[in-house]
Interface confidence: low
């Protein structure tokens, strides 16, 4: 139950986000944890033997659209997802391999978590 | 401070390829979501978008020109590069990049003419 | 592809006037994870590049006069100029951002009348 003076409203996003990294932390994360002014992400991708590999880590406000919607290599089985509503929140996307597809891009938007 | 600079080579003759670049400061194609596009405009006419490269090499194009385009970077160099290969006088045009999803910041164009 | 098309193609205005422009997408721009509508407005003066005046359909850019507004939804949106300044005579496109391949419209020139 809600304590008295607990707002239950949505808590806004962070203005600087924490991020948890794996394969994608830059230079300057610590303790795999990056920082970002837009999403946390989490991708499934097949590597060029055709095995599955988990990436995460921190995505720019800017350039973030597509990202978190789109998959533009044809014919790439990659499945992405954000989020922003709390520090570290992508440690609890489990994004999934999209069916292969045979056509040239996907219009339908990814999952935002 | 973004910004993007095109360069090309002014002119050419048709069924040449064309090469363009895109250098740029401010920004890092390193840089995790970062993408860069390419926009093209001929004389007296609209807005057409060619291309667009993103951080992990994610890359799209044009459908309707895609079998003659193609995009790559050199991240080390802050650059974007497109070519067009056998380019005919309709490619004419002033050629753009810009940074983004939804173009924040564009170079200042480079005018590219085909003619015989 | 998404086809936008924008009216009317040329605006003759005076100084000062009220002017509304329309864009409209032939699929619904609007994505329903996250409420926005994947829509901008660019303003390209002669001999100039474009520049990016409103995102997400209604959101200014930074340092862009409060006497630009962008509305609408779906597939229906309009560009608003509340008080036309001389130096707002230019070209105006919208573009979608919704799914590849990006496209624009043809634009709406304003002219002095």
């Known amino acids: 139950k809600k304590e008295d003076g607990e707002s239950t409203a949505p808590t806004p996003r962070p203005k600087i986000l924490r991020c948890k990294c794996h394969h994608h932390c830059p230079e300057d994360s610590v303790n795999n944890i990056c920082s970002t002014d837009g999403y946390c992400f989490t991708m499934i991708e097949e590597d060029d033997s055709g095995m599955p590999v988990v990436t995460s880590g921190c995505l720019g406000l800017e350039g973030s659209d597509f990202q978190c919607r789109d998959t533009p290599i044809p014919h790439q089985r990659r499945s992405i997802e954000c989020c922003t509503e709390r520090n570290e929140c992508n440690k609890d996307l489990h994004p999934t391999l999209p069916p292969l597809k045979n056509r040239d891009f996907v219009d339908g938007p990814i999952h935002h978590k | 401070q973004v910004t993007l600079k095109e360069s090309g080579p002014g002119i050419l003759q048709p069924s040449q390829t064309l090469s363009l670049t895109c250098s740029f400061s401010?920004?890092?194609?390193?840089?995790?979501?970062?993408?860069v596009g390419w926009i093209r405009q001929p004389s007296g006419k609209g807005l057409e978008w060619l291309a667009h490269?993103?951080?992990?090499?994610?890359?799209s194009y044009n459908p309707a020109l895609k079998s003659r385009l193609t995009i790559s970077k050199d991240t080390s160099n802050n650059q974007v590069f497109l070519k067009i290969a056998s380019v005919v006088t309709a490619d004419t045009a002033t050629y753009y990049c810009?940074?983004?999803?939804?173009?924040?910041?564009w170079g200042q164009g480079t005018l590219v003419t085909v003619s015989a | 592809d998404i086809v936008m098309s924008q009216s009317p193609s040329s605006l003759a205005v005076s100084v000062g006037e009220k002017v509304t422009m329309s864009c409209k997408s032939s699929?619904?721009?609007?994505?329903?994870?996250?409420?926005?509508?994947?829509l901008a407005w660019y303003q390209q003066k002669p001999g100039q590049s474009p520049k990016l005046l409103i995102y997400w359909a209604s959101t200014r850019e930074s340092g862009v006069p409060d006497r630009f507004t962008g509305s609408g939804s779906g597939t229906d949106f309009t560009l608003t100029i509340s008080s036309v300044k001389a130096e707002d005579l230019a070209v105006y496109y919208c573009q979608q951002y919704y799914s590849f391949p990006l496209t624009f419209g043809a634009g709406t020139k304003l002219e002095l009348k």
């Open positions: 490269i993103w951080w992990n090499d994610d890359k």
């Open positions: 810009a940074r983004g999803d939804r173009f924040a910041y």
């Open positions: 699929q619904s721009l609007l994505y329903s994870n996250n409420q926005k509508n994947y």
């Open positions: 401010g920004l890092s194609l390193s840089t995790p979501g970062m993408s």
